[in-house]
């Protein structure tokens, strides 16, 4: 049994890092491999992470994390049984994916203005709290040409848009992901869609 | 919110024992350090030493190496800094401080007064 | 006593800027990120920068903090009164053994 690709780790500076990688052949991951990591820290404990199937050799793991700070570094140990298939180390600041944004949702009680609002997936005492700006995709379920993305650079996780830039009497689906320049994370994924139905008054022309 | 509550002012003699108590509130107990630090009147802040109130190791500053011991309760979120064999120089305020790398909170300290 | 030398006081009018410096080694601020902690008068420590740059939220912009090398600096901006305190950096040590120094303080006056 070897390891094909080495495991990559990415974490949502929060509670949770994700390990991926790939044997040189068909795994039960979950029986035959374990992944141990252990924070380089006085007095830190080793955990281990059952890995969980990702496709037939492929393996996942989420590893548990108290605490993140920029400091922090892991060492990663894959074992099957008492063999040690390979041995690394996780900087869990160098390689930051957001957790997705939640709570879409499209106010158009505004008159001829949509609101769309979103929650930040971070607490306050989360360094990325304040430091995360957003794109909001925004498209058409009619015309599939129809497709925009507004860049959201403020704090506040909300976007205010004309309803007259999008079609009358058509319906729309918005989603928003998120990112942090000061750790040069990835995007998040995406967060649920929410869908609504656009209308609006004509301007009544002279 | 984060709140550290701390035991009250004691006055010992030279040669006994104190010890002092951290209560903590407003997050997960056993997910983040404790350390103490002390700071004698008109003088700078000391670090003690250090609790993992998951497991309970523990790690001293090499000058109280053999006088102190950090304990925990995991039961009321407690944690507790015995200092023995007292002398006149540890009168001083005792604190305790949530954190790993740097100290996000602290308690509001505790006065240890060692006088014969 | 510590292995971090800040000066023992420093002084500028409200407005001002003022800055206070903290040198270590190279085994602690050289291999490691840097903390502030403002002491108000007869006050608990109040982390003010961690990271050696980055402010915990509710701490106003007004204070920043940078490394270079072996030592640290801790700026602030547009001060006001209730900036009169006692300043400390802090950082850890891993080398002989894990410890956490503390600057030796030092006492801002708003004149």
């Known amino acids: 049994m070897k390891v094909l690709q080495e495991p990559t780790c990415v974490s949502d500076y929060m509670s949770i890092s994700t390990c991926e990688w790939k044997m040189n052949g068909p795994t039960n991951c979950s029986t035959e491999l374990r992944l141990l990591y252990q924070l380089v820290f006085l007095l830190s404990e080793a955990h281990t992470c059952i890995p969980e199937n990702n496709g037939g050799a492929g393996c996942v793991c989420h590893l548990l994390m108290d605490d993140v700070v920029s400091a922090d570094n892991y060492t990663l140990d894959l074992w099957a049984g008492q063999q040690l298939l390979w041995k690394g180390s996780f900087k869990p600041s160098e390689h930051v994916k957001p957790r997705a944004p939640g709570n879409l949702t499209v106010h158009t009680n505004v008159s001829d203005t949509l609101l769309l609002t979103w929650s930040n997936p971070y607490p306050p005492d989360n360094y990325l709290y304040n430091h995360l700006t957003y794109a909001v995709n925004i498209w058409s379920e009619n015309d599939p040409a129809d497709f925009r993305i507004y860049n959201v650079t403020y704090l506040e996780p909300s976007l205010r848009i004309a309803a007259s830039t999008l079609k009358s009497g058509i319906s729309y689906r918005a989603r928003v992901r998120a990112w942090a320049q000061c750790y040069n994370t990835t995007w998040s994924e995406w967060s649920p869609s929410t869908k609504w139905h656009n209308s609006y008054r004509e301007p009544f022309e002279q | 919110q984060v709140q550290l509550v701390q035991s009250g002012a004691e006055v010992k003699k030279p040669g006994a024992s104190v010890k002092v108590s951290c209560k903590a509130s407003?997050?997960?107990?056993?997910?983040?350090?404790m350390h103490w630090a002390r700071q004698a009147p008109g003088q700078g802040l000391e670090w003690m030493g250090i609790?993992?109130?998951?497991?309970?190791?523990?790690s001293y500053a090499q000058k109280f190496q053999g006088r102190v011991t950090m304990t925990r309760d995991t039961s009321t979120s407690t944690v507790y800094m015995e200092l023995s064999s007292l002398r006149s120089e540890d009168t001083a305020v005792y604190y305790c401080?949530?954190?790993?790398?740097?100290?996000?909170?602290w308690g509001k300290g505790t006065r240890v007064t060692v006088s014969s | 006593q510590s292995v971090l030398t800040q000066p023992p006081s420093v002084s500028a009018a409200p407005g001002q800027k003022v800055t206070i410096s903290c040198s270590g080694g190279?085994?602690?601020?050289?291999?490691?990120?840097v903390s502030w902690y403002q002491q108000l008068p007869g006050t608990a420590p109040k982390l003010l920068i961690y990271d050696n740059n980055k402010r915990p939220s509710g701490i106003p912009d007004r204070f920043s903090g940078s490394k270079s090398g072996t030592s640290a600096t801790l700026a602030i901006t547009g001060l006001q009164t209730g900036d009169e305190a006692d300043y400390y950096c802090g950082t850890w040590d891993t080398s002989p053994v894990w410890e956490w120094p503390f600057g030796t303080g030092t006492k801002l006056t708003v004149l």
């Open positions: 190279s085994s602690n601020i050289g291999n490691s990120y």
């Open positions: 401080a949530r954190g790993k790398y740097w100290m996000y909170d």
């Open positions: 609790i993992n109130p998951s497991g309970g190791s523990t």
């Open positions: 407003g997050y997960a107990f056993t997910s983040y350090y």
